[in-house]
Interface confidence: low
């Protein structure tokens, strides 16, 4: 057992354009109150399905009168926490709906009028006993900021409030096999007392007095092995004599969900997922209209003026689903470019950029050559987040620091011999050829194919390539 606690920090206009008008005025003063509805699990269930984990209503906030012409500020809030007690184990995963209601305090006939200002919904994982978790949710132009936590009521402890704690009998240590109860180090974990006779090998309990069976075992005390080989009937009574576990009628047998609702089994009962226009435990209630405010998260409701016509929710950016109840995973749109890691912080998207890239969406390719020197006269060439050096003749390697063998590529043509030289290479040409790489044949009459041989160079002399 324990308590889910919700603290509303602020309710007011969200950031960006289109600030909402204040819900109150000098002519019509009003005050706010909040309702929270909790459901176990992370199911995409209809907003109208029961608040199986519990619900709570806040006190009324201070009376507020808008100043004429002023933008809507954060509205004054009720004092205190919203507390939702839970009797059983805390499920760890839960869905919530938080509604902001306005109570108009004008001279209405028949007392104050209530209207729903905003509704936010979400699904979260939360361990009992942990610190306050903070959240920001938007509903249209409104923004709600709140904190929540689940805490166990003594003597329950643990992340699901299923372990029990007792004050320790001795100041130094707990009994055999029992641990101190963090964070209550002065207390000891109490042994759970299961149902009398519950098999210590095949049974266990999460609540005192129960006996739950490990897989493969059945019976009230978990002493009967399960054998499915001799099971013939798909449904029927279980047979303790044969050791055959034959499940009895299922909660969804005969589909208890009306009006086309689909049934799913839950640990304790069943749940109906209702089509649009119907709600209730068995989808038996019809006539959801836009007047009921079925669209979450600031969705715009269209149609459904009478109970026979369906409504459609037009969802704001970031939400989807027939009731705008599902938050879009904004990172699934892959907004971060060039392999950046996307992080949805709730208040903003952030991109963690790979080396070589920058910008809010990693869209800028950094100057890869900045601060990178290529040695020995090489020039830096950018490309794809890395840099490359185009080296001067006679040098190689990533940064042009390695001296290359200029003769490795056999640069001297027509059988010329190559000699490495401090400033490059020298070709000693075979008879009948000349030129820096011995590429030009010498004509038989002694005239070169070149317009003129450089002065002082005879054909066949070594040619230095500069």
């Amino acid at each position: 057992a324990g308590v889910f606690e919700l603290q509303i920090h602020s309710f007011g206009p969200g950031p960006g354009p289109g600030a909402p008008r204040s819900p109150c005025s000098a002519r019509l003063p009003c005050r706010l109150f909040f309702r929270v509805c909790l459901k176990p699990g992370l199911s995409e269930e209809a907003a109208e399905s029961p608040c199986a984990l519990g619900a709570a209503l806040s006190a009324r906030g201070p009376v507020y009168t808008e100043q004429p012409g002023a933008p809507a500020p954060d509205l004054p809030l009720p004092d205190g926490l919203l507390q939702v007690p839970f009797r059983d184990a805390w499920p760890g995963t839960f869905s919530f709906i938080i509604e902001t209601w306005r109570e108009e305090l004008g001279d209405q006939i028949g007392g104050p009028a209530w209207s729903l200002l905003a509704r936010v919904a979400g699904r979260r994982r939360l361990a009992a006993g942990g610190p306050w978790a903070r959240d920001i949710q938007r509903a249209g132009a409104w923004e709600l900021r709140f904190s929540y936590r689940a805490r166990c009521e003594p003597p329950a402890v643990g992340t699901a409030c299923t372990r029990l704690c007792r004050p320790r009998s001795a100041p130094s240590r707990c009994g055999p096999g029992l641990r101190p109860c963090a964070p209550l180090e002065d207390e000891c974990e109490a042994p759970l007392v299961c149902r009398a006779g519950c098999s210590p090998e095949h049974g266990f309990c999460e609540q005192p007095g129960e006996c739950r069976c490990l897989e493969g075992w059945t019976g009230p005390l978990c002493t009967v092995p399960v054998s499915t080989s001799s099971c013939l009937s798909p449904r029927g009574p279980s047979s303790a004599t044969t050791g055959c576990l034959v499940p009895g009628p299922g909660p969804c047998d005969g589909n208890p969900c009306a009006n086309g609702g689909s049934c799913s089994e839950t640990p304790r009962s069943f749940e109906c997922t209702c089509p649009r226009g119907f709600y209730g435990l068995r989808c038996e209630v019809s006539g959801v209209t836009c007047a009921d405010g079925p669209c979450f998260n600031g969705g715009l409701c269209v149609g459904g003026a009478d109970p026979d016509s369906a409504y459609i929710c037009h969802c704001p950016p970031g939400f989807q689903g027939s009731n705008c109840e599902k938050r879009v995973d904004r990172c699934s749109l892959q907004p971060c470019r060039n392999g950046g890691l996307c992080l949805d912080l709730g208040h903003a998207l952030r991109c963690r950029c790979r080396a070589g890239f920058a910008g809010p969406r990693c869209e800028h390719d950094l100057d890869d050559c900045a601060g990178r020197a290529c040695a020995n006269g090489g020039t830096c060439v950018e490309g794809g987040g890395a840099h490359r050096c185009s080296c001067a003749l006679g040098f190689g390697g990533r940064d042009c620091r390695e001296r290359a063998d200029p003769c490795a590529a056999r640069p001297c043509a027509h059988g010329g011999r190559c000699y490495a030289h401090f400033s490059g290479l020298v070709c000693a040409c075979a008879p009948g050829y000349m030129g820096a790489r011995c590429e030009f044949p010498v004509h038989p009459d002694g005239a070169s194919a070149l317009p003129a041989a450089p002065p002082g160079l005879r054909p066949g002399d070594p040619q230095r390539y500069l």
Epitope: R134, L343, L345
Partner: antibody
Framework: QVQLQQSGPGLVKPSQTLSLACAIS??????????WNWIRQSPSRGLEWLGG?????????DYAVSVKSRITINPDTSKNQLSLQLNSVTPEDTAVYYC??????????????WGQGTMVTVSS | QSVLTQPPSASGTPGQRVTISCSGS????????ANWYQQLPGTAPRLLIY???QRPSGVPDRFSGSKSGTSASLAISGLQSEDEADYYC???????????FGTGTKVTVLT
């Protein structure tokens, strides 16, 4: 209540590495709602946010563009502390350095808890 | 250096109302919430206002904040001698992908 206790040398030589630590009590460095930051203040530059680290099922860092190439902010979960390393310092890095916590009032960038500050002088 | 601009000084006599402005751009105050810090001489800054107009517990209600467009302002009504301090505005900047502070305003209480 939450407290941040800073430690580290007050004098660093140019081109060396500035290293500071921030011990956290009353909160956890791996809290999934807090953001742990380093901020500095000097007469010439005023208040300057240097960067932050935070845990959201894995660790993330945000660094200011002005120091991005020189800064490292590391959480130490075993000691429940935060460290700052600033490489290749120059006299321009002379300032009072603060660690701070953000995120708790529901605004990631509102810093509600501050360390006492450490005056660091960069001089040979 | 700072991308948020504040007047260097403001003053008033005890009991007076003093307002400090903070001018930014669409990438900071225009698209994010503004925060305000108070720094008393020789101490670390203290969060005074967050999310434009919210006061943390312990901050007197004579301090109030507001935001309009790309500017924010801090008002101190009923000025007291202990309010003599430096005041800084701040906001997240989407284009710099970082948190930016204002240039700071020194508030003097005249006696």
């Amino acid at each position: 209540q939450v407290q941040l206790q800073q430690s580290g040398p007050g004098l660093v030589k140019p081109s060396q590495t500035l290293s500071l630590a921030c011990a956290i009590s009353g909160d956890s460095v791996s809290s999934n709602s807090a953001i742990w930051n380093w901020i500095r203040q000097s007469p010439s530059r005023g208040l300057e946010w240097l960067g932050g680290t935070y845990y959201r099922s894995m660790w993330y860092n945000d660094y200011a563009v002005s120091v991005k190439s020189r800064i490292t902010i590391n959480p130490d979960t075993s000691k429940n502390q935060l460290s700052l390393q600033l490489n290749s310092v120059t006299p321009e890095d002379t300032a009072v350095y603060y660690c701070s916590r953000g995120g708790i009032v529901g605004v990631p960038d509102a810093f509600d808890i501050w360390g006492q500050g450490t005056m660091v002088t960069v001089s040979s | 250096q700072s991308v948020l601009t504040q007047p260097p000084s403001a003053s008033g006599t005890p009991g007076q109302r003093v307002t400090i402005s903070c001018s930014g751009s669409s990438s900071n105050i225009g698209s994010n919430t503004a925060n305000w810090y108070q720094q008393l001489p020789g101490t670390a800054p203290r969060l005074l206002i967050y999310r434009n107009n919210q006061r943390p517990s312990g901050v007197p209600d004579r301090f109030s904040g507001s935001k309009s467009g790309t500017s924010a302002s801090l008002a101190i009504s009923g000025l007291q001698s202990e309010d003599e301090a430096d005041y800084y505005c701040a906001a997240w900047d989407d284009s710099l992908n970082g948190y930016v502070f204002g240039t700071g305003t020194k508030v003097t209480v005249l006696t």
